[in-house]
């Protein structure tokens, strides 16, 4: 007996071939011997089966001795043994229809769990193997679970259901609601304008919710809310903003924040949270601000950085066109009685410059002694 696997909602062709390549009598019946369809002259006739309105046959193939039955919009309960009667012989085809669905909405927040449930006909013992877009493999029986969804799990999951050495493939689109980056750092010289961007790692027709940016300045003892906003159909509206700093926010997605100028007192790290309508939990993105200042005071040239920097970052003071360099894995570096010329303050990570600031040191002439 031939076994054919089908997918719920799909269309399947059950083949039945006669030895003679000509138009002949044929009938398709179910296991209860109820006629589904057949031929009467050149007319396709339908029987009293529940399947009849969804069953069809291709007249153009009858002349080739092919008397297939096509079943549209498959249901789990269509699983049965079907009998094709042609040329005084009977061909049996066992049809097994499976359905694979996500238990919840397929738009899930990062960290949430995904459960896939397999619908299968009674008496079957299928196995399921799923592969995520990122190459993660999960397998199971009637249910499959992915405990903690990650950003890279977004996309089309390919699931293979196996039964009696036959397979049928399902594709399920999963959208993991998260920002493109978990964390980002902005490096700025003192006084420069700062741009924070929070691009989502997903696209939705409608995006509605509310969000807030909390900020922990390095110099402050506690964090404070810098801005709160609403999101309605991808339109951003600010609800409340602090007076210092006076942040500006873009009206369209991706979420975009502008700090008029980078100052040492703003250096630190923030956490932007976004609560989406009809979703439990929140999207998070951490953002860091590192501010650099280079100053000359009397005989001292100083370069400082504020904000969350890694201990492996190097801070250097370097005289342009000369070999003079002072470097430290610290947040401040200085030179006493610096030579005249253009000095560069550099913050670098393994040779890659993250931030630089130039300061001109003018020659100091000794003050003439008063007679």
């Amino acid at each position: 007996k031939k076994v054919v696997l089908g997918k719920k909602g799909d269309t399947v062709e059950l083949t039945c071939n006669a030895s003679q390549k000509k138009n002949t009598q044929f009938h398709w019946k179910n296991s209860n011997q109820i006629k589904i369809l057949g031929i009467q002259g050149s007319f396709l006739t339908k029987g009293p089966s529940k399947l009849s309105d969804r069953a069809d046959s291709r007249k153009s193939l009858w002349d080739q001795g092919c008397f297939s039955m096509i079943i549209k919009n498959l249901k789990i309960e269509d699983s049965d043994t079907y009998i094709c009667e042609v040329e005084n012989k009977k061909e049996e085809v066992e049809l097994l229809v499976f359905g694979l669905t996500a238990n919840s909405d397929t738009h899930l927040l990062e960290g949430q769990s995904l459960t896939l449930t397999l619908e299968s006909p009674p008496g079957s013992s299928p196995s399921v193997k799923c592969r995520s877009p990122g190459g993660k493999n999960i397998q199971g029986g009637r249910t499959l679970s992915v405990p903690q969804l990650e950003r890279q799990d977004s996309g089309t999951w390919t699931c293979t259901v196996s039964q009696d050495q036959k397979t049928v493939e399902f594709k399920i689109d999963i959208v993991v609601l998260a920002f493109q980056k978990a964390s980002s750092t902005v490096y700025k010289k003192e006084g420069e304008q700062v741009e924070f961007s929070f691009p989502p790692a997903f696209t939705l027709e409608k995006l509605t919710g509310s969000g807030e940016l909390w900020w922990q300045a390095e110099r402050a003892s506690s964090s404070k809310s810098w801005i709160t906003f609403d999101l309605k159909n991808k339109e951003v509206s600010v609800k409340r903003v602090t007076q210092d700093p006076k942040l500006q926010m873009g009206k369209k997605l991706p979420l975009h924040l502008t700090l008029p100028q980078a100052l040492p007192q703003y250096a630190g790290s923030g956490n932007l949270t976004l609560a989406l309508e009809a979703k439990t939990g929140k999207l998070h993105q951490e953002v860091n601000l590192v501010v650099m200042r280079a100053t000359q005071f009397q005989e001292n040239l100083t370069c400082e950085v504020w904000g969350p920097t890694s201990p492996k970052l190097t801070l250097s003071l370097k005289l342009e066109n000369k070999g003079t360099t002072v470097s430290k894995q610290a947040k401040a570096v200085w030179v006493l009685n610096p030579e005249a010329g253009m000095w560069q303050c550099l913050l670098s990570d393994s040779g890659q410059v993250l931030l630089e600031s130039n300061i001109k040191v003018v020659p100091t002439w000794p003050t003439p002694v008063q007679p």
Partner: antibody
Framework: QVQLQQWGAGLLKPSETLSLTCAVY????????WSWIRQPPGKGLEWIGE???????NYNPSLKSRVTISVDTSKNQFSLKLSSVTAADTAVYYC?????????WGQGTLVTVSS | DIQMTQSPSSVSASVGDRVTITCRAS??????LAWYQHKPGKAPKLLIY???SLQSGVPSRFSGSGSGTDFTLTISSLQPEDFATYYC?????????FGQGTKLEIK
């Protein structure tokens, strides 16, 4: 709701090979046959051929020697290749789903053969 | 090949008119016939299949009849959106063939 979206080169020189692809979205790919039909300017519709998900084909005898229809089930796509084209192959080419009747159809692609 | 012949090749009518288009097959095709509506720049649309079955979503003013070699498409009361070219198609045997079309124009 099943939708068919087609694409391919619109301008060819005589003797070149016409190549079109049709992608099936939002519906079943298996169980159906997938056809190519063309309509030369100011003329009627002409069936070119068909394929099913397992690669079984039927072609119009008038074009059989020049036609190849192939299928890529992993992408729910099927393609048409028509070799050694002449000006007589200038037409709007349509892809369509078929059991016995053509429904739905792709949006059509105008292919012009000109030297 | 089965030849499909439509008549008339064009017809002029007014909104509200009853219009009949005929299609003749060169051999018996039982009821393996479909009717399509085709508008310029659009894809053809299935109206009637199996000679007389109305495709889902098609207005009931369209009807089909016939069996064997002679078939008819009737539009009971023409609407402005019905002005188009109509084709019949046989699904009895390969190659599938279409009628040459009937252009329905506004009088």
């Amino acid at each position: 709701q099943v939708q068919l979206q087609q694409w391919g080169a619109g301008l060819l020189k005589p003797s070149e090979t016409l190549s079109l692809t049709c992608a099936v979205y939002g519906g079943s790919f298996s169980g159906y046959y997938w056809s190519w039909i063309r309509q030369p300017p100011g003329k009627g519709l002409e069936w070119i051929g068909e394929i099913n998900h397992s690669g079984s084909t039927n072609y119009n005898p008038s074009l059989k020697s020049r036609v190849t229809i192939s299928v890529d089930t992993s992408k729910n796509q099927f393609s048409l290749k028509l070799s050694s084209v002449t000006a007589a192959d200038t037409a709007v080419y349509y892809c369509a789903r078929v059991i016995n009747w053509f429904d739905p159809w792709g949006q059509g692609t105008l292919v012009t053969v000109s030297s | 090949d089965i030849q499909m012949t439509q008549s008339p090749s064009s017809v002029s009518a007014s909104v509200g008119d009853r219009v009949t288009i005929t299609c003749r097959a060169s051999q018996d095709i039982s009821s393996w016939l479909a009717w399509y509506q085709h508008k310029p720049g659009k894809a053809p649309k299935l109206l009637i299949y199996a000679a007389s079955s109305l495709q889902s979503g098609v207005p009931s003013r369209f009807s089909g009849s016939g069996s064997g070699t002679d078939f008819t498409l009737t539009i009971s009361s023409l609407q402005p959106e019905d002005f188009a070219t109509y084709y019949c198609q046989q699904a009895n045997s390969f190659p599938y063939t279409f009628g040459q079309g009937t252009k329905l124009e506004i009088k």
